[in-house]
Interface confidence: medium
């Protein structure tokens, strides 16, 4: 058993048929000795009397808010949550496996630059009685501070018959050093509580591995005289780290016909312009990636050839 | 070539070679994100490698103030990785394929370190840890870890030389 926050406790249970459960002893937090009774949740049924209550916690029916009273007055209460372990593995019922980049990926995180700011998100099909709390640090044995905001519902999607809810959180490393080579990973821990079920999810990464720049901005076409060629130009996204002479990007320019089946022409360049042939009804797209470290490409920025 | 006594290196040459190093490091181990090597208890292996840290003066301001601190740190790292790539971790079984980019990577690390340190000018280098795994699979895992770590190191080095070439070249 351990304390999640004041008066909220998590009981870790091996979850299998006829498991013995855990014997938990609750003591009423009061100097009173006599006339104390215990109830569970909203029920008025008296579970026991006396300063201590011993319960065998085996299933969700044994969890909940235990309250001790005297003469109609509430003296103290303790909320017991359950954390299930099946076949030695902690349950992951609350969040959806995103399966990207690999199986058992419940949390996904991205950073737009090297400032130490990043966003993580996760998915669930649960709509009510759900709370999340997020903690983060750089390293685990001697952790350095990372401050995370509150998790918020950021999107709702319909997937077949089910609704899917996306939650996200923004975190900022307290004393980030954008130019340094990271040696300790960022650790992100999400506590999830659904009704009386507790679960925790973790992710560990280097900022450099979760970098995904915003798309290039101000994408423009300038036709070249007496030619089917155009000069495409663009700028670094505003959110990218500066100076750009240090934090450089590389770019991929793509000419794509109207039909997805048409051959795509691609050019790679470190410059912020390129000359390409603009076919009728085609579009030109540009995306960006860190020049020196192969993290994710940005989304495409596009303009029509016409 | 760099000149002893703390004057500027050949920023543009260093820029070109460090960018080539980035390309080679990624072609030697392109598996980004597919193998979470940090779960394989790599504290004792890759924690020993030299990292370019916050106080090493490799940020734009630090380079403007005095690039020698940073260049010395980069040189240490290049020598360290050059020795690792020449050790039995990479020369032992399982043998590298004849066209493996590791050979080129090894030569380029040496080339860049020589650009940074001319004859008769010696910076102290870090001791290479005695990592000699007995099993071929351990060697393979260690190679991946070293290459992943090298990718991060050369990325910072390449940023330094790109910025130097753009802003500090005479």
């Amino acid at each position: 058993i351990w304390e999640l926050k004041k008066d909220v406790y998590v009981v870790e249970l091996d979850w299998y048929p006829d498991a013995p459960g855990e014997m938990v002893v609750l003591t009423c937090d009061t100097p009173e000795e006599d006339g104390i009774t215990w109830t569970l949740d909203q029920s008025s049924e008296v579970l026991g009397s006396g300063k201590t209550l011993t319960i065998q916690v085996k299933e969700f029916g044994d969890a909940g808010q235990y309250t001790c009273h005297k003469g109609g007055e509430v003296l103290s209460h303790s909320l017991l949550l359950l954390h299930k372990k099946e076949d030695g593995i902690w349950s992951t019922d609350i969040l959806k496996d995103q399966k990207e980049p690999k199986n058992k990926t419940f949390l996904r995180c991205e950073a737009k630059n090297y400032s130490g700011r990043f966003t993580c998100w996760w998915l669930t099909t649960i709509s009510t009685d759900l709370t999340f709390s997020v903690k983060s640090s750089r390293g685990s044995s001697d952790p350095q501070g990372v401050t995370c905001g509150a998790a918020t519902l950021s999107a709702e999607r319909v997937r077949g018959d089910n609704k899917e809810y996306e939650y996200s959180v923004e975190c900022q490393e307290d004393s980030a050093c954008p130019a340094a080579e990271e040696s300790l990973p960022i650790e992100v821990m999400v506590d999830a509580v659904h009704k009386l079920k507790y679960e925790n999810y973790t992710s560990s990464f280097f900022i450099r591995d979760i970098i995904k720049p915003d798309p290039p901005k101000n994408l423009q076409l300038k036709p070249l005289k007496n030619s089917r060629q155009v000069e495409v130009s663009w700028e670094y996204p505003d959110t990218w780290s500066t100076p750009h002479s240090y934090f450089s990007l590389t770019f991929c320019v793509q000419v794509q016909g109207k039909s997805k089946r048409e051959k795509k022409d691609r050019v790679f360049t470190d410059k912020t312009s390129a000359t390409v042939i603009c076919r009728k009804n085609a579009s030109i797209s540009v995306r960006a990636q860190d020049r020196y470290y192969s993290s994710s490409w940005s989304e495409w920025a596009s303009v029509p050839c016409s | 070539r760099a000149v002893p006594g703390g004057s500027s290196p050949a920023w543009t040459q260093c820029q070109q070679l460090s960018q080539k190093l980035c390309t080679l490091a990624w072609s030697a181990h392109p598996l980004v994100g597919h193998m979470d090597l940090r779960e394989e208890g790599d504290e004792e292996t890759t924690n020993d490698v030299p990292h370019i840290q916050c106080g090493d003066g490799c940020d734009p301001q630090g380079l403007r103030d005095n690039s020698q601190f940073c260049l010395q740190r980069i040189h240490q790292g290049l020598i360290f990785y050059e020795k690792l790539l020449g050790s039995d971790i990479f020369t032992g079984e399982p043998s590298l394929l004849p066209d493996s980019p590791v050979g080129q990577l090894h030569a380029s690390l040496l080339g860049l370190s020589q650009l940074l340190q001319p004859e008769g000018h010696h910076w102290e280098t870090q001791q290479i840890p005695s990592l000699s795994p007995s099993q071929p699979w351990q060697r393979l895992l260690l190679r991946f870890k070293i290459l992943r770590s090298l990718q991060a190191f050369v990325a910072v080095a390449a940023r330094v030389f790109a910025h130097g070439a753009a802003t500090l070249s005479p």
Partner: nanobody, 124 residues
Framework: EVQLVESGGGLVQPGGSLRLSCAAS????????MYWVRQAPGKGLERVAP????????LYADFVKSRFTISRDNAKNTVYLQMNSLKPEDTAVYVC?????????????????WGQGTQVTVSS
């Protein structure tokens, strides 16, 4: 300097009782969960019982079966283990420990403070 000093161990006959004490100093005792753990000859560490800072929540290991009671006195910086109906298999070194964490005690990273332990021998 952090110190945890156990006392109260000794030789006792089966069915007998002992009260172990653990006096703490050098850290904010009232912020920490406290644990009694034991190590029998040739066996690994076994957690006997944890107790939250307020002394209101505990959970006993299966082998305890209502025979042991853990309590604490935050004014005296002391945690106790009252052991009744002792059996030969309770023979072990009993150690008090504080886990690495105060309020948020996940206890994944082991114990941060340890005592030296007190020997309990149950034999006729």
């Amino acid at each position: 300097e952090v110190q945890l000093v156990e006392s109260g161990g000794g030789l006792v006959q089966p069915g007998g009782s002992l009260r172990l004490s653990c006096a703490a100093s050098g850290f904010t005792f009232s912020n920490y969960w406290m644990y009694w753990v034991r190590q029998a000859p040739g066996k690994g560490l076994e957690r006997v019982a944890p107790l939250n800072p307020g002394g209101t929540i505990t959970l006993y290991a299966d082998f305890v079966k209502s025979r042991f009671t853990i309590s604490r006195d935050n004014a005296k910086n002391t945690v106790y283990l009252q052991m009744n109906s002792l059996k030969p298999e309770d023979t072990a070194v009993y150690v008090c420990a504080a886990p690495s964490g105060t309020l948020y005690t996940r206890n994944k990273s082991g114990y941060i403070y340890w005592g030296q332990g007190t020997q309990v021998t149950v034999s006729s």
